[in-house]
């Protein structure tokens, strides 16, 4: 069966350029190794933002230089993307792969539109 992946339609990043959303998948099998990838779709181009592989029951770990962090709980992954600016506004797609044991399963969410608004610079204050 096809694996369903759910994620929110829209998220607004904080003034500090941080956006968080939940990616939830309905696992057709009993996977012990899962890979989660965040993709960004801009126009017709899809690029990888970050990826992490984790063992079920363990925390997922992104690379040290990744702009993503996350926690996992069962079939749910809480993803946080940081360092976002207005130009990063776009559709962020959650891709889930059940890697082990075979068979492999792929699930791709419909995407979360993340809106990022750059903060206004603070005006100079006279004291």
């Amino acid at each position: 069966k096809a694996m369903h992946v759910a994620q929110p339609a829209v998220v607004l990043a904080s003034s500090r350029g941080i956006a968080s959303f939940v990616c939830e998948y309905a696992s057709p099998g009993k996977a012990t190794e899962v890979r989660v990838t965040v993709l960004r779709q801009a126009d017709s181009q899809v690029t990888e933002v970050c990826a992490a592989t984790y063992m079920m029951g363990n925390e997922l770990t992104f690379l040290d230089d990744s702009i993503c962090t996350g926690t996992s709980s069962g079939n749910q992954v809480n993803l946080t993307i940081q360092g976002l600016r207005a130009m990063d506004t776009g559709l962020y797609i959650c891709k889930v792969e059940l890697m082990y044991p075979p068979p492999y399963y792929l699930g791709i969410g419909n995407g979360t539109q993340i809106y990022v608004i750059d903060p206004e610079p603070c005006p100079d204050s006279d004291f």
Epitope: K1, A2, M3, H4, P28, E33, R35, T37, L39, V46, T47, E48, A51, T53, K95, E97, M99, Y100, P102, P103, Y104, Y105, L106, G107, I108
Partner: antibody, heavy 118, light 107 residues
Framework: QVQLVESGGGVVQPGRSLRLSCAAS????????IHWVRQAPGKGLEWVAA????????YYADSVKDRFTISRDNSKNTLYLQMNSLRVEDTAVYYC???????????WGQGTMVTVSS | DIQMTQSPSSLSASVGDRVTITCRAS??????LAWYQQKPGKVPKLLIY???TLQSGVPSRFSGSGSGTDFTLTISSLQPEDVATYYC?????????FGQGTKVEIK
């Protein structure tokens, strides 16, 4: 540019072995799963094997399980297919193909011909 | 394992005709379906993924539709360069199965 180039095909006798290679260039090899797909003369496409990212996860078609081994060397941007106990029915053009970020096979090599004949 | 069945196995149509090829999965695969074109003596080429999304550079006369078990590839106006064999493929899980192919010729 993005490309895959296969090599190592040839004529072998049944029961013998052969190793195919697929050299990748123009993209970050370790970020992609790569497949072997074959096509017997005048026939359709048949998926053979796949290997993911760091090489720890491998998948095989039932027709080649326990005879073929897929592997990769990310430092050399190269994919391999070790084919043992070859059979006449393994005669085909063997293609390597990249698993695109959204799941379909978006880049294919030019293929290498393997003929198993006595 | 999920089986992929294409129909027809071959067809002949005139230039400018609308051509439709169908692909049926033995179980639901959502929209995890791709279509490939293989011209005689050439390498397969990705045309459509996610059942209906056109791969970059593919002419707009090609379109795909369907979800679940039934899918369609349509060529709105057949051109001489479209002579090829077309394959559907499911990619939601291993094994990555192809349909048996549909050979398209010009009358």
């Amino acid at each position: 540019q993005v490309q895959l180039v296969e090599s190592g095909g040839g004529v072998v006798q049944p029961g013998r072995s052969l190793r195919l290679s697929c050299a990748a260039s123009g993209f970050t090899f370790s970020n992609y799963g790569i497949h072997w797909v074959r096509q017997a003369p005048g026939k359709g496409l048949e998926w053979v094997a796949a290997i993911w990212y760091d090489g720890n996860n491998k998948y095989y078609a039932d027709s080649v399980k326990d005879r073929f081994t897929i592997s990769r060397d990310n430092s050399k941007n190269t994919l391999y297919l070790q084919m043992n106990s070859l059979r006449v029915e393994d005669t085909a053009v063997y293609y390597c193909a990249r698993n695109g970020v959204l799941g379909a096979f978006d880049i294919w090599g030019q293929g290498t011909m393997v003929t198993v004949s006595s | 394992d999920i089986q992929m069945t294409q129909s027809p196995s071959s067809l002949s149509a005139s230039v400018g005709d609308r051509v439709t090829i169908t692909c049926r999965a033995s179980q639901g695969i959502s929209n995890y379906l791709a279509w490939y074109q293989q011209k005689p003596g050439k390498v397969p080429k990705l045309l459509i993924y996610a059942a209906s999304t056109l791969q970059s550079g593919v002419p707009s006369r090609f379109s795909g539709s369907g979800s679940g078990t039934d899918f369609t590839l349509t060529i709105s106006s057949l051109q001489p360069e479209d002579v090829a064999t077309y394959y559907c493929q499911k990619y939601n899980s291993s094994p990555w199965t192809f349909g048996q192919g549909t050979k398209v010729e010009i009358k």
